[in-house]
Amino acid sequence: GSQWTDACLSHPCANGSTCTTVANQFSCKCLTGFTGQKCETDVNECDIPGHCQHGGTCLNLPGSYQCQCLQGFTGQYCDSLYVPCAPSPCVNGGTCRQTGDFTFECNCLPGFEGSTCERNIDDCPNHRCQNGGVCVDGVNTYNCRCPPQWTGQFCTEDVDEGNSGLNDIFEAQKIEWHENLYFQGHHHHHHHH
């Protein structure tokens, strides 16, 4: 009889499609958005009218498409009315305030910035790590990675002096944070309450 050959060994199917061998020939099952014998052709969804509603512009993408909506509309198909703060675009706990029909403003929590509070402010430029400590940024704070003979959040405590009085200055979790950071090399962020 004829010898069976795995036609899929040469990976003929493109763009994440699934290959199967039928009668020594490959067959490609394409992902949505691709076509052709080897799924090598991107389907231009924008050739089909009506994908984007309310005057939205269709933008073809590899394997998919995107609607660019006119002001006042939103959603995958521009089928929803745009309400600036519903849902809130503000991240990291920021509070959204509607400033106009189509505009908003995010009031960011301390330590964050950006139009949607998307950026954690780097607190290290103003650090005060003492005694050779190296700054590690946190959320609206920073911590210090200390050389072996120093400890504490800011490397102000001499290890040789022992832990007497440390609790006067540092909460247990800050000491724990420091030990994790220095001795295990973990870059934990200390969130203050």
Epitope: P110, N126, R128, Q130, G132, N140, T141, T156
Partner: antibody, heavy 120, light 107 residues
Framework: EVQLVESGGGLVQPGGSLKLSCAVS????????MEWVRQASGKGLEWVAA??????????VYSASVKDRFTISRDDSKSTLYLQMNSLKTEDTAVYYC???????????WGQGTLVTVSS | DIQMTQSPSSVSASVGDRVTITCQTS??????LAWYQQKPGKSPKLLIY???RLQDGVPSRFSGSGSGTDYTLTISSLQPEDFATYYC?????????FGGGTKVEIK
């Protein structure tokens, strides 16, 4: 004994320049953050500039009121801290103190101060 | 910048009195607070660092306490040499900021 001695103060016209020096002794200069703090007559203390230690690459920070006008620097071989003051304004009139950041988030040693008067 | 609100701005007291000065910061400074004493024509002198640690050579009648945003300097029994101006200062981050000062005067 830790000692800091400032010099270089004096009378200067608005827009003029002056360079303050702070000679230190009694400690390893490069191990410590060094600060300049000023005090106008009858007023409170105002931080001006800082230079971190060798472990922090001698990085520098300025107050907003002097940024781009003042320059802090140090010469480890002479154990001296400097403050170059340019484009001086009448509101820069004050006693200028050099101080050592003692490794405890506090300024544990201060110089005697040097008076800078900016007036026409 | 971290704002420092020091109060009172002045206090009249007698020798032997207990004097309390407070300092409030605009954000958590993690006990990175120092207290200084300054006499007329003299440089400031460090009294307390780390909110509660007594600097070497400072009499034990001076004490500091507090955490977060609220800090206190206490002089347990005022002595004649304690009449001066006191400043708090945060050392948590640059720019370093000082309180407005508290003048302790003789009643």
């Amino acid at each position: 004994e830790v000692q800091l001695v400032e010099s270089g103060g004096g009378l200067v016209q608005p827009g003029g320049s002056l360079k303050l020096s702070c000679a230190v002794s009694g400690f390893t200069f490069s191990d410590f953050y060094m600060e300049w703090v000023r005090q106008a007559s009858g007023k409170g203390l105002e931080w001006v500039a800082a230079q971190r230690n060798k472990a922090n690459d001698f990085s520098i920070v300025y107050s907003a009121s002097v940024k781009d006008r003042f320059t802090i620097s140090r010469d480890d071989s002479k154990s001296t801290l400097y403050l170059q003051m340019n484009s001086l304004k009448t509101e820069d009139t004050a006693v200028y103190y050099c101080s050592r950041d003692g490794g405890r988030l506090a300024l544990d040693a201060w110089g005697q101060g040097t008076l800078v008067t900016v007036s026409s | 910048d971290i704002q420092m609100t020091q109060s009172p701005s002045s206090v009249s007291a007698s020798v032997g009195d207990r004097v309390t000065i407070t300092c409030q910061t605009s954000e958590d400074i993690y006990s990175g607070l120092a207290w200084y004493q300054q006499k007329p024509g003299k440089s400031p002198k460090l009294l307390i660092y780390g909110a509660s640690r007594l600097q070497d050579g400072v009499p034990s009648r001076f004490s500091g306490s507090g955490s977060g945003t609220d800090y206190t300097l206490t002089i347990s029994s005022l002595q004649p040499e304690d009449f001066a101006t006191y400043y708090c200062q945060q050392g948590f981050k640059y720019p370093l900021t000082f309180g407005g000062g508290t003048k302790v005067e003789i009643k």
